[in-house]
């Protein structure tokens, strides 16, 4: 084993760790679960001990990201590089960073849980073996009704056991359909689907309609998706497999490596391949995120990597079921924080639950359960008819508006909404608006005409907010939002829209909170926003005050900027920070002077 | 002993090409991080591109990106990088360094061996 | 980018004399400081990285501290062969950026 130079360790016994995000390969809960197993490895033979938080004060910050992703040590796109680790010390050190370019799994092929069947809900085995024949992917072979399944062993033959994969024949998520499953065809703007379309919307998501007639009824649901038929690379990247597809005259119904001489799966997107030539890779074993992680806090408690092959700090991945951690690597984090105190608890045994009765559904029939359990995100809008064409990329046109004093930046007392938009600040007045990068001897660039980068908002607004997943900038002014994507727009929509009442005169700011979720301000009154569902949880409203204490109350814009929240009164700001899970003060300034760094002359 | 020897400058017209090498011996080449730096006459260091160990990530800085490529071959223990629609403003010398970081422990942060630079003047 | 601010442009000391030069980085970038020496003619030369351990081969009269946005290197006495030109190089976020350099001059 190595430590790194100085022996650097931590110098507390009870370590905390946030896990910032997700990677979408794995659910939530498999994840959470994967980091608490791989710290369970380090506190089984250490004093140590390790505490989930949820606050970036963490000791251990755990972020899934690709390529630049705020730090000084870019991810490499899909395999080479897997993830990274800091050694202990206090900000970014001890933090643990994943590349999720790669295919996250337990190292077993992608993660699908079931559900139904008979297996409680237990994930797919990929491969498994059903009559006699291998299958890489779920299946619809041995059903009439075209449901999606799996086997749970590697063996349906010998095991029967199976469950039923994410598909849209079983049900939908979020919407507002109840979760009801799609209806094929269906009707929408006239024309017929019998498949899941993102038409109509300019985020990507997939959607069908619940019932026959979409336009009629309304009525719809988002369509599950399906990692483990989600292809890679070929030409049809983020498509699914079809399965059966037509190869060279030949039927397959499962990824296949015929036509390669690498053995690499891959499978058609389309039904017929020597027609359409769509097709890309089939997924394939994925990472042990438990394995990685294991590593990865590895280095994050102070260990370097070993010169013992067998050992999990050697700098090589290498996916085992049996035990990770190496004589060497005891010794070396025992090296750092000494043995665990009491006795070594004995390996816990592990047995899987047997179900009590005989399974009474096999894939041969429909399954006999049916969905009972409601979608947990709120009501969503219908999907936003015709889609709204691409974000343009590339620099904007905006016109510079002549110059006079008031177009200073600097000499204007109080914005109308200041947001940040990609990695500047942006300040709103009066039809204008100015940009800000920070930086030694900075200054806001502008004033640029609203009317030519966002031709559709009118001169006032209340506040601007961007949500960086899918660079969506909603506008707010008055009872009025307007959603843009790149240079198409949504709206103006009625904040009714959104689920705000009546009462609601404006909105005057947004923050972050968590993937997909903001926080919208009225006045002394706050509420969560899905971004996906554009609606706000109703149950959420909440006093400003309780969430932040020592904020005004009469604040006329509240956003967020590197990662800390503003809120603006007159022309000041109060700036607030969260640690150990409480929103505190910690800073009130001016935003020329503070923010802007403009001259106090 | 580590060495890093760069080849391949010259004297080429705006708009042109050129090819830089740089052999490295001395460690084990296919494990690190390698870069490209360089430093116009009379001026400081300004990073030009950065490759991964495995070849597989590569990046630029904004001044070339679109018209330098850089990679390696870990077989012959070279790095490379081509310079096309070349400008008078890349006129520099241009040093190949090798990473302290490697694979995925981020610390060590320093270009520990440099080669000893190359001469690439655009000019008409 | 991460603007890096080396102080002073210039310095003039003699041979035995304490040099410290300052290196400030235009946001936080943790211990991710990396100081090189180079000399007319040559390639820079690693001296410190991640802030305060010196490179191998260094002499232990240079040294490195600061963190987050400040930095220093001290030479604790002065040799003829140390005058040269230093830069601070930082990692804490992408792009690396180089400071515009300290020449330590014979006074």
């Known amino acids: 084993f190595q430590t790194f130079e100085g022996d650097l360790k931590w110098h507390h016994h009870n370590i905390t760790y946030w896990i910032q995000n997700y990677s979408e390969d794995l659910p939530r809960a498999v994840i959470d679960d994967a980091f608490a197993r791989a710290f369970a490895l380090w506190s089984a033979v250490t004093p140590l001990t390790f505490t989930r938080v949820y606050s970036r004060d963490a000791d251990i910050v755990i972020q899934f990201g690709v390529a630049e992703h705020g730090d000084g040590y870019p991810f490499d796109g899909k395999d080479g590089l897997l993830a990274h680790a800091f050694p202990p010390g206090p900000g970014i050190q001890g933090d643990a960073h994943f590349d999720d370019d790669e295919l996250w799994s337990l190292g077993k092929g992608v993660v699908v849980p079931t559900r139904f069947g008979n297996a409680d809900g237990a994930a797919c085995h990929f491969p498994f073996i059903f009559e006699g024949r291998s299958y890489s992917a779920c299946t619809t072979d041995g059903r009439s009704d075209g449901l999606p399944w799996c086997s749970t062993t590697a063996n349906y033959d010998t095991d029967d056991r199976f469950g039923f994969c994410p598909s849209e024949r079983l049900y939908t998520q979020d919407g507002n359909a109840d979760g009801k499953p799609c209806q094929f065809p269906f009707i929408f703007q006239g024309q017929s689907y019998s498949a899941c379309t993102t038409d109509g919307r300019s985020d990507g998501y997939r959607w069908c309609a619940t019932t026959a007639n979409y336009d009629r009824d309304k009525l719809f649901g988002f369509c599950p998706t399906r990692a483990d038929s989600t292809v890679m690379g070929g030409n049809s990247a983020g498509e699914l497999c079809v399965f059966p597809f037509t190869f060279l005259g030949k039927e397959y119904s499962t990824c296949t490596s015929e036509g390669r001489g690498d053995g690499r799966l891959w499978c058609a997107t389309t039904s017929n391949f020597d027609s359409d030539k769509k097709w890309g890779f089939c997924p394939d074993q994925g990472y042990s995120l438990f394995l990685v992680a294991a590593h990865e806090f590895g280095h994050a408690l102070g260990l370097d990597h070993s010169s013992v092959p067998e050992a999990l700090m050697y700098p090589m991945y290498r996916f085992t079921e049996g035990p990770p951690l190496h004589k060497d690597d005891v010794n070396g984090i025992r090296h750092l924080y000494g043995p665990r105190p009491e006795p070594e608890p004995r390996p816990p045994t592990t047995t899987t639950p047997q179900p009590t009765a005989p399974p009474t559904v096999c894939p041969t029939g429909p399954p006999t359960v049916h969905p009972s359990e409601r979608p947990t995100a709120g009501p969503t809008g219908p999907p936003s008819a015709g889609p709204t064409g691409p974000p343009t990329a590339g620099p904007s046109t905006a016109t510079t508006v002549p110059l006079s004093p008031v177009d200073d930046a600097c000499n204007v007392n109080i914005f109308d909404a200041i947001a940040e938009i990609g990695n500047q600040l942006y300040l709103f007045k009066d039809g204008k608006y100015w940009r800000f990068s920070e930086g030694r001897g900075s200054r806001p660039q502008g004033p640029f005409l609203i009317a030519d980068k966002w031709p559709a908002l009118p001169r006032k607004l209340d506040s601007v907010f961007e949500e960086r997943l899918s660079k969506k900038l909603f506008f707010f002014s008055g009872r009025q939002v307007w959603v843009y994507t790149g240079a198409s727009v949504l709206g103006p929509r009625r904040l009714d829209k959104l689920g705000l009442g009546a009462d609601v005169a404006q909105v005057t700011g947004a923050l972050r909170s968590g993937r997909g979720k903001m926080l919208l301000f009225s006045g002394r009154r706050l509420w969560r926003f899905d971004v996906k569902a554009q609606m706000v949880d109703p149950r959420s409203a909440s006093e400003v005050d309780r969430m932040f204490p020592g904020v005004p109350l009469d604040t006329h814009d509240v956003f967020q900027y590197r990662e800390k929240a503003y809120f603006c009164q007159d022309r000041f700001y109060w700036r607030v920070s969260s640690r150990s899970e409480l929103n505190q003060v910690d800073q009130v300034g001016y935003v020329t002077y503070d923010i802007l760094q403009c001259p106090e002359d | 002993e580590v060495q890093l020897l760069e080849s391949g400058g010259g004297l080429v017209q705006p708009g042109g090409s050129l090819r830089l090498s740089c052999a490295a011996s001395?460690?084990?080449?296919?494990?690190?991080p390698m870069w490209w730096v360089r430093q116009a006459p009379g001026k400081g260091l300004e990073w030009v591109s950065?490759?991964?160990?495995?070849?597989?990530?590569?990046f630029y800085a904004d001044s070339v990106k679109g018209r330098f490529t850089i990679s390696r071959d870990n077989s012959k223990n070279t790095l490379y990088l081509q310079m096309n629609s070349l400008r008078a403003e890349d006129t520099a010398v241009y040093y190949c360094?090798?990473?302290?970081?490697?694979?995925?422990?981020?610390?060590?942060?320093?270009?520990?061996?440099w080669g000893q630079g190359t001469l690439v003047t655009v000019s008409s | 980018d991460i603007q890096m601010t080396q102080s002073p442009a210039t310095l003039s000391l003699s041979p035995g004399e304490r040099a410290t030069l300052s290196c400030r980085a235009s946001?936080?970038?943790?211990?991710?400081l990396a100081w090189y020496q180079q000399k007319p003619g040559q390639a820079p030369r690693l001296l410190i990285y991640?802030?305060?351990y010196r490179a191998t081969g260094i002499p232990a009269r240079f040294s490195g501290s600061g963190s987050g946005t400040d930095f220093t290197l001290t030479i604790s006495s002065l040799e003829p062969e140390d005058y040269a030109v230093y830069y601070c190089?930082?990692?804490?976020?992408?792009?690396?950026?180089f400071g515009q350099g300290t020449r330590l001059e014979i006074k």
């Open positions: 950065y490759i991964y160990p495995s070849g597989g990530g590569t």
């Open positions: 991640d802030a305060s």
């Open positions: 360094a090798k990473d302290r970081a490697y694979g995925d422990y981020v610390g060590w942060n320093g270009f520990d061996y």
């Open positions: 001395g460690f084990t080449f296919s494990t690190y």
């Open positions: 946001q936080s970038i943790s211990s991710f």
């Open positions: 190089q930082q990692r804490g976020n992408w792009p690396i950026t």
